[in-house]
């Protein structure tokens, strides 16, 4: 049978040839009557076998951490007969481990963050070295952490790279610390091998600094023009922490000013100085008042750290501006009658300087040849007004310093101009009508209607009359429907066209206003034959078409 | 018996390239691993490179890497040196030498009588 | 790379005499030296393996000894044959590396 040992080869051997042991048959006597062979993975290329010996030889560098354990035949011949002496067999060489590999931190980069102020033995983080080296085989594989830069803030637990708080830190002196740990294999042996990994360790912010003022005193200053929320300025607190640590409120004590208001700007954390009131020079010139910031997320656990708040007194001047006329109402409305001779008086509007100075007021009516002012804001009129060509004037006056003539004001004056019955009603259009040559008596010929162009405080009622001859004239009548119309109808039976063919019938149209203003209008009346139907609208017809040149039968 | 009978040698200029042979017989040339050694005239000798029988492992001096590249075609029994980039310290004979069996597989017990190459210009 | 030192660098001995050639390696290399013969215009020949095996063929009167860093090669008696330049070679390290020579030439 086979006789061998189990085969051991040294991994990362530097010779050429490394002679691992010896595989032979009993029956060998030693005459180099037999020959070895090796067959199967790596045989002829990372093993071979003494074919007379049957030793066999590693002939490369072997890597455990690559590969463990080779399987391989072996095979023996007797050479006279070329038969196998001993049946081919399966055998193993394992690849035993040396400390060729250092631990290495596998996850880096390492980063952990830890909130400043954490008590002694808060966890940070764990690191985590892997050793390729055979774990079974001594101590080859086995670790031990070190701090080599990091004390006194930290420490690290030898056999499971915990790393931990050692000592309070304080985020404001210093952010973040680089600490480095070594792990060494062989339990920190002679002969050990060692990787070294850096941590990152950020401190967070804890809320343990309150914002104050830098400066206990802020100048500023108002212009007395400025409108209601008005930035007039900024004021600005320090906190040493950072990000919502750091974001504060300002605000102002409550006895203080109603006329400033302070809001916080939460991008810069700067408060602005608001102006919540008009403020006016000639009432008062300086303002003072005492402004306090507070952080915006205090834990209670912390309050410890913001008892009193930090205060800062600001000082407000108003700045006097030369300011425009002001006049006493915000626009004036002011009535006058039509048909007022030139020189009427209109009205009066006022208007002064609101400075210490006091400056005389000039005034005048933009774009109005209608209307005078003169200095003492006195409106009259300049020409004779007619209601029926514009009832309201649309103006505007302006206020003038005589010391300043830039400082102006305006305002809008509104002139309504009053009716006086000055126009007579009229025909509501031109009115031209027919009557036929066989109309009877009491036809209606025409609907008529009035106009009138002044303006009736009541409504307009019109009276409708005709003429004293065309009274005594019988051939046609009035009806004055009480409704502002009237119709005209035949007096007679029958017209004759050849006789008289047209008539012009005078209607007198009264109004209702005082006094009361009557027109005489014109009615024209053609007679036409219309043929047996009789009808107007037939008459009308044919006059139209006989109007139009056409001849009909 | 075993033979070893080399070829490809001659006059080149510098930085030039050849390719030199070694045609073997009387042995299971795929069973041995093969070398090629230079001398250098009147110098000692100086090992080349080395391949192992199935060529799979190869080895060259410090003084050739990279330049010199030794192969093997077993089915020839034939050992290669293609040597490139040659400088005049290049200049020897160069013979190729088999290797031994067991723990002398890196050894050489049979030598050719060697190819001459000189590099000049 | 192991440095291999041979002396003397020439011996001079007459035939029949006893030639005795020293090999020094750098650093240890076990038993794993070899020794070659060369004669003018003639490739290396084997001679010892393994320190002190002999090669097929070669005759008793030559003998190798020696381990670790350092060898020898004996010639009991030399024959007129014998007088040849002799190298030393370590093949237990990459690169393998030969020695200076000894040349052993007639007194």
């Known amino acids: 049978g086979w006789v061998w040992n189990q085969f051991f080869v040294p991994e990362e051997m530097n010779t050429t040839s490394h002679h691992i042991g010896q595989l032979r048959s009993d029956l060998d006597n030693g005459n180099n009557s037999f020959q070895y062979k090796l067959l199967g993975a790596g045989a002829g290329s990372t093993f071979i076998i003494d074919e007379r010996t049957g030793d066999i030889y590693a002939i490369q560098k072997l890597d455990r951490e690559e590969r463990s354990l080779y399987i391989l035949r072996a095979q023996v011949i007797d050479i006279a007969t070329g038969r196998a002496v001993e049946p081919e067999s399966e055998f193993v060489i394992k690849v035993s481990d040396i400390n060729d590999n250092e631990p290495k931190f596998l996850d880096e980069p390492y980063e952990a963050i830890v909130p400043e102020m954490s008590p002694e033995g808060t966890l940070v983080i764990q690191v985590t070295a892997s050793d390729a080296d055979d774990p079974s085989s001594g101590n080859n594989a086995r670790l031990l952490y070190s701090l080599l830069q990091g004390q006194p803030y930290f420490s690290v637990e030898p056999t499971t790279g915990v790393i931990r708080i050692s000592s309070k830190m304080d985020r404001e002196l210093q952010d973040e610390y680089w600490v480095i740990i070594q792990a060494k294999d062989m339990i920190g042996q002679p002969g050990a091998l060692s990787g070294t990994t850096s941590v990152l360790i950020k401190l967070s912010d804890v809320n343990d600094n309150k914002p104050i003022f830098k400066e206990s005193l802020y100048r500023l200053t108002v212009s007395e023009s400025a409108p209601t929320g008005t930035s007039i300025g900024t004021i600005m607190a320090y906190d040493n922490d950072i990000g919502e640590n750091a974001e504060m409120d300002y605000s102002i004590e409550e006895d203080d000013s109603q006329t400033f208001d302070i809001i916080t700007n939460h991008e810069t954390q700067e408060g602005i100085v608001i102006l919540k009131k008009k403020v006016d020079f000639e009432h008062q010139n300086h303002y003072g008042i005492r402004a306090k910031v507070k952080n915006h997320h205090v834990p209670e656990q912390l309050m410890k750290y913001h008892t009193e708040a930090s205060t800062t007194f600001i000082k407000i001047q108003v700045e006097d501006v030369d300011e425009p006329p002001l006049f006493l109402l915000p626009y004036y409305v002011f009535e006058v009658f039509e048909e007022t001779p030139q020189g009427s008086f209109v009205g009066v509007v006022s208007a002064t300087d609101p400075d210490n100075r006091k400056s005389p007021i000039r005034y005048s009516i933009t774009r109005s040849k209608v209307f005078n002012i003169n200095d003492n804001g006195t409106i009259t009129t300049s020409n004779s007004l007619d209601r029926e060509i514009s009832a309201w004037y649309n103006l505007s006056i302006t206020a003038t310093e005589k010391y300043n003539i830039e400082q102006i004001s305006s305002i809008p004056l509104y002139v309504q101009v009053l009716n006086i019955n000055d126009h007579a009603p009229e025909f509501s259009q031109y009115y031209e009508t027919y009557v036929c040559e066989n109309a009877g008596s009491g036809q209606v010929i025409q609907t008529i209607s009035a106009v009138d162009r002044d303006e009736s405080i009541e409504e307009h009622h019109f009276y409708f009359n005709l003429s004293v001859e065309d009274t005594n004239n019988s051939s046609f009548t009035i009806i004055d429907n009480q409704d502002n119309t009237a119709v005209i109808l035949t007096n007679r039976t029958g017209f004759n066209l050849q006789e008289e063919p047209v008539f012009y019938i005078s209607i007198l149209i009264a109004d209702n206003g005082i006094p009361s203003l009557t027109s005489t209008n014109t009615l024209t009346i053609h007679v036409c034959d219309c043929g047996d139907s009789g009808s107007t609208q037939t008459c009308q017809y044919q006059e139209l078409v006989l109007s139009m040149g056409f001849k009909t039968e | 018996q075993v033979q070893l009978l080399e070829s490809g040698g001659g006059l080149v200029q510098p930085g030039g390239s050849l390719r030199l042979s070694c045609a073997a017989s009387g042995f299971t040339f795929s069973s041995y691993a093969m070398n090629w050694v230079r001398q250098a005239p009147g110098k000692g000798l100086e090992w080349v490179s080395t391949i192992s029988g199935g060529g799979a492992n190869t080895y060259y001096a410090e003084s050739v890497k990279g330049r010199f590249t030794i192969s093997r075609d077993n089915s020839k029994s034939t050992l290669y040196l293609q040597m490139n980039s040659l400088r005049a310290e290049d200049t020897a004979v160069y013979h190729c030498a088999k290797g031994g069996m067991g723990g002398y597989y890196y050894g050489m017990d049979v030598w050719g009588q060697g190819t001459t190459v000189t590099v000049s210009s | 790379e192991i440095v291999m030192t041979q002396s003397p660098v020439t011996l001079s001995l007459s035939l029949g005499e006893r030639a005795t050639l020293s090999c020094r390696a750098s650093q240890s290399i076990s038993s794993n030296l070899a020794w070659f013969q060369q004669k003018p215009g003639q490739a290396p020949r084997l001679l010892i393996y393994g320190a002190f095996t002999r090669a097929t063929g070669i005759p008793a009167r030559f003998s190798g000894s020696g381990s670790g860093t350092e060898f020898t090669l004996t010639i009991s008696s030399l024959e007129p044959e014998d007088f040849a330049v002799y190298y030393c070679?370590?093949?237990?390290?990459?690169?393998?590396?030969f020695g200076g020579g000894t040349k052993v030439e007639i007194k």
């Open positions: 070679q370590q093949y237990n390290y990459w690169p393998l590396t």
